[in-house]
Structure formats: structure tokens, C-alpha cells
């Protein structure tokens, strides 16, 4: 039989982060190689990664079609013998389905991971100081150009802003529905920054990790009385 | 200074689909905010249906998901409201609105500051 | 979702005296979401305060909001003829946002 001696991959995982979506399987395969499907609940099975010797595959232009919708994938294990007659065999020579382990589903706009954000700019004029999050690019696309994560998300993305005073340890939060703060400081400290991305109404990937600390008086700043 | 105006049919029938346009005036759609659709049955309150953002991110009301799509057009200015299989407790006055952001609190939140001046759509045969 | 009430349904009361308008929410509301609005017959709402505490501009310092949590109120210290209307509060913080079902003030 043409599915002889192969083994069904296992622990499926899908790896996604602001929507660049990999799916990760084991084992390292011996004397196989792998092909992957991708559907929607309702859609048809499209054919990804054939016949690969890797472990993981790239999903993203798959999922950003749309990113609301929940997917579901299966990896298919195939003789080696048979990955050679090209992508229409991927089935074995007797034309019986090779052995596959599905997904768990995955909804892009639900479970992809907040990435790292980064502070983009800060401005102080006088006691106040203006704190800007860098909007990153996903590769969301809508009439042939890049969303950013912002365009995605809308207002179910909020950042919170983490700063203290260089000389202290205490630090004050605030939150905003946009890309920008305005916080008050005291004249004459230097404070530090640190954002978070986070989605409020998720159950799950609620948070990103800490953007790196940006502190005034370094070169992202800009100061004017 | 933005102005709202929504157009569309004053009379839908039962099960039909009710479609609103809200044109922008005096101000690019694509400007950082967001446009709403709310509506009010006669002599009741208000009632939020969605909104969407230039970029074609939307939410909407959970009780009207199934019936309601709310689309952008950047380049005529305008953000469109659909309502299929309408009935006669869809009948109210629709209004269209911006989200615009406000400071408050060290960050800046969304509040409907300019509306439409709201049109009437009864669901009648 | 998040229900909004408020009270008392209906205000009868005279030019010059104050009045004072409650909002309660049915789950905890951060005041950063909480806006209140007036609206005459016949004309769209009106956006007055928002961030439960601060005037919208070109709004009269005679009207105030106060509050958090579950209970948020506006205060209009001195009525004006023009202040007659209907007063809504509502959340923009949890979808869907809502409104409370509104507070008329009516002269005596």
C-alpha cells in the first residue's frame, strides 16, 4: 500500500504573531515528507508545503485572506516514494488517502499573538510629553496595500503606557484607544516609557510582551519648553 | 467643519434590505476616525447598530450582526449601512455619527461628536 | 452587555434650579468610555461630556459630570430655558456600546 511505514505527524501547533502564521508539527520525518491543507469551516481544502521535509509551514497568504474567519489544517504524511510524481499525486499509488493529523482551528483575529510594540517618538513641551507607538505593518492586505495593526483591530486595541522617573522606581499607567499619549510630568525629571499592546474583549493572547524601555534624554526624544 | 448627511429610501418593505448612505463633508473620512450608525425607534432611545473605520475594520451590535454590514467608500467620503430582512421594528430615525478622539486621562478616547441630522425609514408594505 | 439606567425618567423642574441627572450601570464602566448627550425634539444628539467628567467644547460650565464605577451622574447647577431636553448617557468601552434609556427635563 502506498502508506506503508508512515508516520502521522502530531502536536500540531499553530505559531502566529500580528498575523504572520506558521504551523508547527512533528516528527522530523524519516523516509516521508509532509504536504498541508488549509480550509475555512465552510471553504475547500487548498493545498500548501507539498511534500516538504520541514516541520512547520507558512499559512500567512492563507489566513490574511481573512482574518475573522476560523481555519482548520491537516498534514498529511507521504511515502517518500510517491512525493515524486508531482503535486496531483498526492495521494499513494493506489490512490488511498495517506495518513493525516488535523489542526485545532485557529482565528487569526482572535489568537494571533500581540507582537512586541516599539515606542516610536516622545515629545515634551513643558510638563507634558507626547508618546507615540509605532503602528506596525501586518501583512493584512485591503485594495493592494498593507494594513497596519491598528487598521486590523480598530478600537479593540489599546496600548498602556508604563512610566516612571528615571530616578524612582515608582511607575503611573495610562491607556489610550489611539497610537498616542500625553501624559503629565514634572519639569526638570527625566522619566522612562514602556507600552503594552492589549485587546481587552480577548479570552486568550489578551497582552503583548513590554515594547523596550525608552528614556528621556536619549536619542528617540525631543524636547522643547 | 465636518458635516453628516444620510440618504436613502424613507420606505422599506418587510423583509427587504434597507440601505443608508452617510456622506462626509468638510473633512477626509480616512482622518484617524471612526463612523457609526445609531438609530432611534419612535419615542424611545438610542440604539448603537456599529461602526466602522476607514480601513474597513468594523464592529457591530451583537443583536443585529446576522442582518447588519456597515462599508467605506474613501473615495467618494461616504460609509454605507445595510439592514436585510427588515421588519416593522427596524422603523425608526437612522443616524450616522463620528468617532473622533478626545484626550482624557493621559490617553485619547473615541466619543460621537458630529452626527447626521437623521433620516426616517419606516418598514411598511 | 452593559445596561445603563437612569433616573428619574422624567425631571419637572423650574429655570434657575438645579438639576441633577444618575446614571447606573449594570457592570462597572470605565469612566473613560462614559459620555453623556442631549437631544432636542426633531435634532440629533448632542455630545456634552465625556470621560464621565469633562465638557465637550463650547458646552456651559453649567453642566458637570461626576461619577465612577457603576454610578455616574450630570449636574446642570442652574437651568437655562435652553437646557429643556432629553439627557442620555451612554458606554463606549464594551460592545456593544449603549445608551441609558434617558432622563427628560421638562419645565414646571
Known amino acids: 500500500s502506498g502508506t506503508t511505514n508512515t508516520v502521522a505527524a502530531y502536536n500540531l501547533t499553530w505559531k502566529s504573531t500580528n498575523f504572520k502564521t506558521i504551523l508547527e508539527w512533528e516528527p522530523k520525518p524519516v523516509n516521508q515528507v509532509y504536504t498541508v491543507q488549509i480550509s475555512t469551516k465552510s471553504g475547500d481544502w487548498k493545498s500548501k508545503c507539498f511534500y516538504t521535509t520541514d516541520t512547520e509551514c507558512d499559512l500567512t497568504d492563507e489566513i490574511v485572506k481573512d482574518v475573522k474567519q476560523t481555519y482548520l489544517a491537516r498534514v498529511f504524511s507521504v511515502p517518500w516514494r510517491n512525493s515524486t510524481h508531482g503535486k496531483e499525486t498526492l495521494f499513494g499509488t493506489h490512490g488511498e488517502e495517506p495518513p493525516y493529523e488535523n489542526s485545532p482551528e485557529f482565528t487569526p483575529y482572535l489568537e494571533t499573538n500581540l507582537g512586541q510594540p516599539t515606542i516610536q517618538s516622545f515629545e515634551q513641551v513643558g510638563t507634558k510629553v507626547n508618546v507615540t507607538v509605532e503602528d506596525e505593518r501586518t501583512l493584512v492586505r485591503r485594495n493592494n496595500t498593507f494594513l497596519s495593526l491598528r487598521d486590523v483591530f480598530g478600537k479593540d486595541l489599546i496600548y498602556t503606557l508604563y512610566y516612571w522617573k528615571s530616578s524612582s522606581s515608582g511607575k503611573k499607567t495610562a491607556k489610550t484607544n489611539t497610537n498616542e499619549f500625553l501624559i503629565d510630568v514634572d519639569k526638570g525629571e527625566n522619566y522612562c516609557f514602556s507600552v503594552q499592546a492589549v485587546i481587552p474583549s480577548r479570552t486568550v493572547n489578551r497582552k503583548s510582551t513590554d515594547s523596550p524601555v525608552e528614556c528621556m534624554g536619549q536619542e528617540k526624544g525631543e524636547f522643547r519648553e | 467643519q465636518v458635516q453628516l448627511q444620510e440618504s436613502g429610501p424613507g420606505l422599506v418593505k418587510p423583509s427587504q434590505t434597507l440601505s443608508l448612505t452617510c456622506t462626509v463633508s468638510g473633512g477626509s473620512i480616512s482622518s484617524g476616525q471612526y463612523w457609526s450608525w445609531i438609530r432611534q425607534h419612535p419615542g424611545k432611545g438610542l440604539e448603537w447598530i456599529g461602526e466602522i473605520y476607514y480601513s474597513g475594520s468594523t464592529r457591530y451590535n451583537p443583536s443585529l450582526k446576522s442582518r447588519v454590514t456597515i462599508s467605506v467608500d474613501t473615495s467618494k467620503n461616504q460609509f454605507s449601512l445595510k439592514l436585510s430582512s427588515v421588519t416593522a421594528a427596524d422603523t425608526a430615525v437612522y443616524y450616522c455619527?463620528?468617532?473622533?478622539?478626545?484626550?482624557?486621562?493621559?490617553?485619547?478616547?473615541?466619543?460621537?461628536?458630529?452626527w447626521g441630522k437623521g433620516t426616517t425609514v419606516t418598514v411598511s408594505s | 452587555e452593559i445596561v445603563l439606567t437612569q433616573s428619574p425618567g422624567t425631571l419637572s423642574l423650574s429655570p434657575g434650579e438645579r438639576a441633577t441627572l444618575s446614571c447606573r450601570a449594570s457592570e462597572s464602566v470605565d469612566s473613560s468610555y462614559l459620555a453623556w448627550y442631549q437631544q432636542k425634539p426633531g435634532q440629533a444628539p448632542r455630545l456634552l461630556i465625556y470621560?464621565?467628567?469633562t465638557r465637550q467644547t463650547g458646552i456651559p460650565d453649567r453642566f458637570s459630570g461626576s461619577g465612577s464605577g457603576t454610578d455616574f451622574t450630570l449636574t446642570i447647577s442652574r437651568l437655562e430655558p435652553e437646557d429643556f431636553a432629553v439627557y442620555y448617557c451612554?458606554?463606549?468601552?464594551?460592545?456593544?456600546?449603549?445608551f441609558g434609556g434617558g432622563t427628560k427635563v421638562e419645565i414646571k
Open positions: 470621560g464621565a467628567s
Open positions: 455619527a463620528r468617532d473622533a478622539p478626545y484626550y482624557y486621562g493621559g490617553g485619547y478616547y473615541y466619543y460621537m461628536d458630529v
Open positions: 451612554q458606554q463606549a468601552g464594551v460592545v456593544p456600546y449603549t
